[in-house]
């Protein structure tokens, strides 16, 4: 992990207007482990689409298929969870769309439709036809995995029939679910075969089993609830940026750092420098200089422009972004060639992003 001796002090000082950053919460796509997931990049007129996960370039492999504007993940695992982005490169500009993928056996988006149609789930039988419990509406039970934002209402349903009319009880993680097990308790609507929990919190995560039984038998069905926590996150940088670059002595060059942050980000451009002829301080850490940072007197902090470069400008340039939650950094190298050599844009290489979980 990088540690630095700063030639100039750095602080958490985000002062740039937020309009340049995607502040809104990204859309969440939910999958259970083992399921396949397909997401379409919601950008128009894309000549070339590139994909990233948690700021790192995403390429095809035996489980990840990239076809046109579609991303397919086969046999999803929890490790596939994260912040994804597709970037559409056009002749004049580029645009990025972000979305979250949540793969967990604790996942959901609660069945919040009103129970206006619930009465028909309560099936009355001819008193002579004794029958063990059975499910009357399996369609309403297909979605076993529910990922629900904290503070939302969750409803689980187990519409059943039988003769005599079965009773229903609920278990949480295999044990009797009691009212005192959660703040605010819960509601059971026997007429609608439903369990309702309002204002869910992270401690509500777990397996919920309805047990439907009469004297002729018992059936059960288990739902898994994940409470998706809402909290701001640290910045994420677009993969491949800044990109390595080369230019001749006297030439100009630009480094670009694209930032995703839902809390105001502070951008710094930092370079390794020498102090008293040494690149490292007495503590063995490299000397760094802040070349540019976001603030009132700084125009577009996402771009570092270098003019009339000299050989001394060659080296590693770090884009470091922080908000009050955390940090991210990626770097690129500048190669300065003698005047007679023609410059060429190098292949974009992402510095290994040590800030990712």
């Amino acid at each position: 992990r990088p540690s630095f001796s700063l030639v100039e002090d750095t602080t958490l000082e985000p002062e740039e207007p937020p309009t340049k950053y995607q502040i809104s919460q990204p859309e969440v796509y939910v999958a259970a482990p083992g399921e396949s997931l397909e997401v379409r990049c919601l950008l128009k007129d894309a000549a070339v689409i590139s994909w990233t996960k948690d700021g790192v370039h995403l390429g095809p492999n035996n489980r990840t298929v990239l076809i046109g504007e579609y991303l397919q993940i086969k046999g999803a695992t929890p490790r596939d969870s994260g912040l994804y982005a597709c970037t559409a490169s056009r002749t004049v500009d580029s645009e990025t769309w972000y979305f979250m993928v949540n793969v967990t056996d604790a996942i959901s988006s609660g069945d919040d439709e009103d129970d206006t149609d619930g009465a028909e789930d309560f099936v009355s039988e001819n008193s002579n036809n004794k029958r063990a419990p059975y499910w009357t509406n399996t369609e309403k039970m297909e979605k076993r995995l529910h990922a629900v934002p904290a503070a939302n209402t969750v409803k689980f349903r187990c519409p059943a029939g039988g003769n005599p009319m079965p009773t229903m009880r609920w278990l949480k993680n295999g044990k009797e679910f009691k009212q005192e097990h959660r703040i605010g308790g819960y509601k059971v609507r026997n007429q609608h075969w439903s369990l309702i929990m309002e204002s869910v919190v992270p401690s509500d995560k777990g397996n919920y089993t309805c047990v439907v039984e009469n004297e002729y038998g018992s059936i059960n069905h288990t739902y898994h609830l994940d409470v998706v926590e809402r909290s701001p996150h640290r910045p994420i940088l677009q993969a491949g940026l800044p990109a390595n670059a080369s230019t001749v002595v006297g030439g100009d060059v630009e480094f670009v750092c694209k930032v995703y942050s839902d809390a105001q980000p502070h951008i710094q451009w930092i370079k390794h420098v020498e102090k008293n002829g040494s690149k490292y301080g007495p503590d063995g850490l490299p000397y760094l200089k802040v070349l540019k940072h976001s603030g009132i007197n700084s125009s577009n902090a996402e771009v570092l422009a270098l003019f009339n470069v000299t050989e001394a400008d060659a080296g590693e340039y770090i884009c470091k972004v922080s908000n009050y939650i955390g940090q991210a950094n990626q770097s690129a190298w500048l190669t300065v060639l003698p005047k007679q050599q023609a410059p060429g844009r190098e292949k974009e290489i992402t510095a290994s992003p040590d800030y990712l979980e």
Partner: antibody, heavy 113, light 107 residues
Framework: QVQLVQSGAEVKKPGASVKVSCKAS????????IHWVRQAPGQGLEWMGA????????SYNQRFKVRATLTADTSTSTVYMELSSLRSEDTAVYYC??????WGQGTTVTVSS | DIQMTQSPSSLSASVGDRVTITCRAS??????LNWYQQKPGKAPKLLIY???NLADGVPSRFSGSGSGTDFTLTISSLQPEDFATYYC?????????FGGGTKVEIK
């Protein structure tokens, strides 16, 4: 789940130093700033500073820059806040917080001769 | 430093009331504002981040609005557990200053 557990109450004499610890668990320690906020009796909240455990970056409220020192030990997922040259007006509850989202239980520091 | 001014400093209300607390920043902080609830002897609890986003586990009766310099925390229907002190905080630039607090008491 995310937890921040702070060290116990301290009673100090004016001029002394105090070192309060904040042990984090339930998340990747290096990925979030730990902030320190204090609250004098019957008063409001005051931000003191923050540290990023991944690289030790610190940021201080100018009011505390001379007297406060924040450090992080990644091997134990613990952050420390040391306040020197204590005076009676430093009597307060000191909180650590992960990015202001999760808070420790608070440590009462009493400065009295 | 950015100054945060809360008003009122205290208010009395009844269960079921709609309560509004305002916070003004001394300069533009865009949407970089958090709201907290604090009960006696307890740590503050994050209610709203980014001026309008409800934090984890916070009931939907709480809402935040505003940007720039003027912000509002609204409790649509006050519940018994909502009697507490509320603070706003600038999270745009250091020092991350807090408002003076608004104490919500039972009428």
């Amino acid at each position: 789940q995310v937890q921040l557990v702070q060290s116990g109450a301290e009673v100090k004499k004016p001029g002394a130093s105090v070192k309060v610890s904040c042990k984090a668990s339930g998340y990747t320690f290096t990925n979030y700033y730990i902030h320190w906020v204090r609250q004098a009796p019957g008063q409001g909240l005051e931000w003191m500073g923050a540290i990023y455990p991944d690289n030790g970056d610190t940021s201080y409220n100018q009011r505390f820059k001379v007297r406060a020192t924040l450090t992080a030990d990644t091997s134990t997922s613990t952050v420390y806040m040391e306040l020197s040259s204590l005076r009676s007006e430093d009597t307060a509850v000191y909180y650590c917080a992960r990015a202001f989202t999760y808070w420790g239980q608070g440590t009462t520091v009493t400065v009295s001769s | 430093d950015i100054q945060m001014t809360q008003s009122p400093s205290s208010l009395s209300a009844s269960v079921g009331d709609r309560v509004t607390i305002t916070c003004r920043a001394s300069e533009n902080i865009y949407g970089a504002l958090n709201w907290y609830q604090q009960k006696p002897g307890k740590a503050p609890k994050l209610l709203i981040y980014g001026a309008t986003n409800l934090a984890d586990g916070v009931p939907s009766r709480f809402s935040g609005s505003g940007s720039g310099t003027d912000f509002t925390l609204t409790i649509s229907s006050l519940q018994p557990e909502d009697f507490a002190t509320y603070y706003c905080q600038n999270v745009l630039s250091t020092p991350y200053t807090f408002g003076g607090g608004t104490k919500v008491e039972i009428k």
